[in-house]
């Protein structure tokens, strides 16, 4: 995930005024890990698996819809925004279905669910180092998606340690 | 519960056409690329033509290209494969196949065939 | 395209392990299906993902994949899991089979 495209994406921010209606721009993209293991969905109707595994060369990877908003409400940190507005990103891996933080069992789910999308569907992006991203839970400042045990998982980051952790670091790339 | 029924299947000369139709039920039918697979009397299994979930993109078998025509009707749930040119090596139980997983933004052609009809038999002969 | 080959048949005795071939070039770089067909019956998928098993399959079926063959180990082969067994894999969005093995319990 190269610096521009956050670059990029705080000019699209700065030309239009829409906070959390509608997305200000609308991105797919793969996501892996720092450690470059993919996320992947096996989805069906009524159930799901999200994997974090090493990818075989012809195995595609999977794609998510990354949604960016605008908010004006401060996480915990200072976000990558502009203006002091926070850019926040939901995550569909196909039609109709959306990441989730479930912060009672400290865990991310995919649901099915209709617009306006629940505030649990949404994340602040922070842009970190080596082209690496973080995403927030809006609802629970200060956890984040990581990487547990081969899943992700919803993970309480302490400020006064490094930011940087490796388990809630991903990268984003068009390929 | 999944359910996969084709139809259509019969007795055609050389150089007919016929439709096949497998009604789907039991899931979001949209949500899911569909397969359409066949096998010929005491053979094994050939892999004919595939569609998305939107119906946007269609693959076929080198076999079949230019001869046969895979749809869908979503709002019917219901795949439809048009053969027509038919041949002698057309003979076959054709069955329809539901990817055993919803299809990603990533699109293509990746998923194992989870759910299977029970097959309609086309036989082309004089 | 890439030939899937597998042995037209293998006999194993009830209670012993059955192992099924399927052999390609680069095979180990695709992940390899494995369906289960019984004479006059739609096949029915017993391994994804080269290692992977549907819900619904007994822990007996097991899968491998790498180098040049995919292998479907069935270990303590019952009565019930005589039938032919296909492999698949996808190929530039094409599906291919092999040949299919006819497993006979003696």
């Known amino acids: 995930f190269e610096a521009q495209k956050i670059e990029w994406h705080e000019a699209a921010i700065e030309g239009r005024s829409i906070t959390g209606i509608s997305p200000i721009t609308e991105y797919l993209a793969s996501l892996s890990t720092y450690n470059d293991q993919s996320i992947t969905f096996a989805l069906e109707d009524e159930s799901y698996e999200i994997y974090v595994e090493d990818l075989k060369k012809d195995k595609k990877k999977d794609k998510v819809l990354l949604s960016y908003y605008e908010s004006q409400h401060p996480s915990s940190e200072s976000g990558d925004g502009v203006d002091g507005k926070m850019l926040m990103v939901t995550l569909s891996p196909t039609k109709d279905f959306w990441l989730q933080a479930n912060n009672k069992e400290h865990s991310v789910e995919l649901h099915k669910c209709e617009k306006p999308l629940p505030d649990q569907a949404f994340f602040v992006l922070h842009n970190r180092s080596f082209n690496c991203v973080s995403f927030e839970c809006k609802t629970d400042p200060g956890v984040f998606i990581g990487v547990k045990d081969n899943h992700l998982a919803l993970i309480k980051v302490d400020y006064s340690e490094n930011l940087g952790s490796e388990n809630i670091l991903f990268k984003l790339s068009e390929i | 519960e999944v359910q996969l029924l084709e139809s259509g299947g019969g007795l055609v000369q050389p150089g007919g056409s016929l439709r096949l139709s497998c009604a789907a039920s039991?899931?979001?039918?949209?949500?899911?690329?569909m397969s359409w697979v066949r096998q010929a009397p005491g053979k094994g299994l050939e892999w004919v033509s595939a569609?998305?979930?939107?119906?946007?993109?269609?693959y076929y078998a080198d076999s079949v290209k230019g001869r046969f025509t895979i749809s869908r009707d979503n709002s019917k749930n219901t795949l439809y494969l048009q053969m027509n040119s038919l041949r002698a090596e057309d003979t076959a139980v054709y069955y329809c196949?539901?990817?055993?997983?919803?299809?990603?933004w990533g699109g293509g052609l990746r998923y194992p065939f989870g759910y299977w009809g029970q097959g309609t038999m086309v036989t082309v002969s004089s | 395209l890439p030939v899937l080959t597998q042995p037209p048949s293998v006999s194993v005795s009830p209670g012993q392990k059955a192992s099924i071939t399927c052999s390609g070039e680069?095979?180990?770089?695709?992940?390899a299906a494995w369906y289960q067909q019984k004479p006059g019956q739609s096949p029915i998928l017993v391994i994804y993902?080269?290692?992977k098993r549907p819900s619904g399959i007994p822990e007996r079926f097991s899968g491998s994949n790498s180098g040049n063959t995919a292998t479907l180990t069935i270990s303590g082969t019952q009565d019930m899991d005589e039938a032919d067994y296909y492999c698949?894999?996808?190929?530039?969005?094409?599906?291919?089979f092999g040949g299919g093995t006819k497993v006979t319990v003696l």
């Open positions: 196949a539901r990817d055993l997983w919803i299809q990603l």
């Open positions: 698949q894999v996808w190929d530039s969005s094409t599906g291919v």
């Open positions: 993902q080269d290692t």
């Open positions: 039991g899931f979001t039918f949209s949500s899911y690329a």
């Open positions: 569609i998305s979930g939107s119906g946007g993109s269609t």
């Open positions: 680069r095979m180990g770089d695709k992940y």
